[in-house]
């Protein structure tokens, strides 16, 4: 028989976990003993089962772990793993600090969507990557021409909404354009919004006519002529 002991104490060296709100936290206390010990978790000295926590908790006894997703300021505290068997018990304290971020307008990754050139009949993907504390929603817009004009009397551009989606933070949103034609050429805008505001970034799609097989074959020669 053997009292519980830590099997990977080097993985437990990080005592203070300071994480931004919304992140996932995982505490592990890998242990062994004979008989095989059990693990219990305490928060601020009280038995912790996560029943009062929005989103609950995940206890994975075979991994000796406690997982909390989307942490909020009320999750701050001292988390204790208590490992025990008939012979003895050991415990370890983790400190959790939840850092509150200032929610901001969505931030769009620079360079996305990117200007793209495609051939008639090909498929095109326009990408938009959004960073947002609050849950963002996305719209893909195409700038259109009405009665020969791109802008209304009020000075605002004419747009057509192609797609609307709610996405998870830091997800890549894709606009698929299948079998593009010359009419698909133009300016496309990725609009991302949250409770603070909206952010936009645009790109141009250029659509070239279908390649002429004769021209394609002759092109390499042409390169070397004066």
């Amino acid at each position: 028989q053997q009292a519980p002991y830590w099997t990977h104490p080097q993985r437990m060296e990080k005592k203070l976990h300071a994480v931004p709100a919304g992140n996932t936290v995982k505490f592990r206390c890998p242990a062994a003993g004979n008989p095989t010990p059990t693990i219990r978790w305490l928060k601020d000295g009280q038995a912790f089962h996560g029943e009062n926590r929005i989103g609950g908790i995940r206890l994975r006894h075979q991994h000796w772990s406690l997982v909390m997703e989307s942490v909020v300021p009320s999750d701050r505290g001292t988390y204790t793993c208590l490992v025990e068997n008939a012979v003895g018990s050991i415990r370890y304290n983790y400190l959790l600090d939840v850092l509150e971020r200032s929610p901001h307008r969505p931030i769009l990754q620079a360079g996305l969507p990117a200007n793209t050139t495609a051939v008639v009949g090909s498929d095109v993907e326009l990408l938009c990557k959004v960073y947002s504390d609050a849950q963002p929603h996305i719209q893909w817009l195409k700038h259109i021409v009405i009665n020969g004009s791109s802008f209304g009397a009020d000075g605002f551009p004419y747009v057509q909404v192609l797609k609307t989606a709610d996405i998870n933070s830091s997800e890549v949103e894709v606009l698929y354009l299948r079998n593009v034609s010359a009419e698909d050429a133009g300016e496309y805008t990725c609009l991302a919004g949250n409770s603070i505001g909206l952010s936009y970034q645009s790109a141009w799609l250029t659509v070239l006519p279908e390649e002429d097989p004769t021209w394609t074959a002759a092109a390499p020669e042409a390169r070397y002529t004066d």
Epitope: P103, R105, Q135, H137, Q139, T189, G193, N194, S195, I196
Partner: antibody
Framework: EVQLLESGGGVVQPGRSLRLSCAAS????????MHWVRQAPGKGLEWVAV????????YYADSVKGRFTISRDNSKNTLSLQMNSLRVEDTAIYYC?????????????????WGQGTMVTVSS | DIVMTQTPLSLSVTPGQPASISCRSS???????????VYWYLQKPGQPPQLLIY???NRFSGVPDRFSGSGSGTDFTLKISRVEAEDVGVYYC?????????FGGGTKVEIK
């Protein structure tokens, strides 16, 4: 006509509660984030809270966090502010303000439409 | 939090003369989308604030063209080319880039 109309203000003692409401009309309320902004007598403007168009995200100023709760009822086009544990320094005119819309908007993306305000006085 | 500092505190202007109000933010309000999210409001006595300028330099609908906004990432200016009697009130700048949204302390404009 786009309109926001606040109600529920009044005189209340410190430590008590009050619930403000804001009735929206003339636009698709359920497509917009909504804010509360307050102004103490003779003072400047202070942002209080925001709620997303579907109510899933809420943020508060530090001065009211844990005491005030913002909520909305999209079926009734109504925004609310539940104010608990009121303090003398909460005395102000409370304005309901339209925030960002869910999609493309011509012009500013919010903070363009304000209600007339409702006065809250916290006094013993 | 982003601090918005407005100057001057008050301004007395002769009708027909220009006026200028400054606002400085403690952090840049230039967003990754290339827009600068500073708004300007006028609050007349007994009324809620009314939007004049959004995104640094765009005049809101119905706002006379004597009002203009300019500036860079942290320094902003609201100009009134020719002040009229109806322009009296308190002017506020506001940052609309992150929560908590914050306002300048206000500039009171009166007519001489």
């Amino acid at each position: 006509e786009v309109q926001l109309l606040e109600s529920g203000g009044g005189v209340v003692q410190p430590g008590r509660s009050l619930r403000l409401s804001c009735a929206a009309s003339g636009f698709t309320f359920s497509s917009y984030a909504m804010h509360w902004v307050r102004q103490a007598p003779g003072k400047g403007l202070e942002w209080v809270a925001v709620i997303s168009y579907d109510g899933s995200n809420k943020y508060y100023a530090d001065s009211v966090k844990g005491r005030f709760t913002i909520s909305r009822d999209n079926s009734k086009n109504t925004l609310s502010l539940q104010m608990n544990s009121l303090r003398v320094e909460d005395t102000a005119i409370y304005y309901c303000v339209r925030g960002a819309g869910r999609g493309y908007t011509y012009g500013p993306d919010g903070f363009d439409i304000w209600g007339q305000g409702t006065m809250v006085t916290v006094s013993s | 939090d982003i601090v918005m500092t407005q100057t001057p505190l008050s301004l007395s202007v002769t009708p027909g003369q220009p006026a200028s109000i400054s606002c400085r933010s403690s952090r840049s309000l230039l967003h990754s989308d290339g827009k600068t999210y500073v708004y300007w409001y006028l609050q007349k006595p007994g009324q809620p604030p009314q939007l004049l300028i959004y995104e640094l330099s765009n005049r809101f609908s119905g706002v006379p063209d004597r009002f203009s906004g300019s500036g860079s990432g942290t320094d902003f200016t609201l100009k009134i080319s020719r002040v009229e009697a109806e322009d009296v009130g308190v002017y506020y700048c506001m940052q609309y880039i992150e929560a908590p949204l914050t306002f300048g302390g206000g500039t009171k404009v009166e007519i001489k």
